[in-house]
Amino acid sequence: ESALITQQDLAPQQRAAPQQKRSSPSEGLCPPGHHISEDGRDCISCKYGQDYSTHWNDLLFCLRCTRCDSGEVELSPCTTTRNTVCQCEEGTFREEDSPEMCRKCRTGCPRGMVKVGDCTPWSDIECVHKESGTKHSGEVPAVEETVTSSPGTPASPCSLSG
């Protein structure tokens, strides 16, 4: 289950703070990996593997760790200072306009088109017209029209916004 808020969403209170860890707030802020207590007098550690905070903050609680969905692989686990990093499984990708799920990459390009970009965890294969070189983002073509391609290897993790 993905958290619905990231600390970026809650960022307007952030401001520069000294870079040493302390058990009491520094200039009203607690260090990454902590949140502020209800009375504002203490910094309370986030729970490893359960929640986190990424910035100096005066949040009254830590943010929930993202749980990778089925169809995703965990690239790095949640720590007290960094959220889980999830990535779509090989052969699937996550589009910016539908970040809630990984979709299967197309297996090939329509007839008259050539593949110029592999399937990555954040993009489908890229096809262009042989002559004009213009991109195509149409529906998955019928099987007999496809040119087989193999999924690309991940280059870098796609970041989940929560």
């Epitope: 619905l4 209170q13 009254l60």
Partner: antibody
Amino acid sequence: QVQLVQSGAEVKKPGASVKVSCKASGYSFIGYFMNWMKQSPGMSLEWIGRFNPYNGDTFYNQKFKGKATLTVDKSTSTAHMELSSLRSEDTAVYFCARSAYYFDSGGYFDYWGQGTLVTVSS
Amino acid sequence: DIVMTQSPLSLPVTPGEPASISCRSSQSLVHSNGNTYLHWYLQKPGQSPQLLIYKVSNRFSGVPDRFSGSGSGTDFTLKISRVEAEDVGVYYCSQSTHVPWTFGPGTKVEIK
């Protein structure tokens, strides 16, 4: 625009329970605490406690622990407060109000519901 | 708990004239972080309270500039530079420096 709309007035007998609701709209419900206040007839305001819709945590004024139970239904962006073992001194107008998730800006209430009158009478 | 007191409890005012309400706390409201968490609300007749001033002197959005807040430590003041008819109601001070948060008894402002 931000709106907090509360349920209607209630008349209850001593010993009964009552559940007051507060439906939020015009903002991200999970992005703010929901607080509850009590205003007894002709009296000032008392802060009862608050609910964190993001993680389900509650934080109560010690005085109202055991009297008030705060919950939310995220699917309908509605906060609830249940008052148990009602007595005549629970007769009051109850308000919901939102506050920020930060310590520095979390102690004041920028939007309030219209209030719900709960009358306890035999 | 922190006890908030206000004076006067009733304030008859003349439209166009200034008005001032005092609020005192039983302990200093200066937090260890240096900030002071004293706020003012107005409850107009038959309505819910509305935020006027937060953290001593900051006007909430949409609040006319005739309202101003000042003070420090345990003594605070809300001033209305020129009272208008729509300003009638009960004014409450509130503190969130110490848990639990508490409110003053209110000052009822009415037109003479």
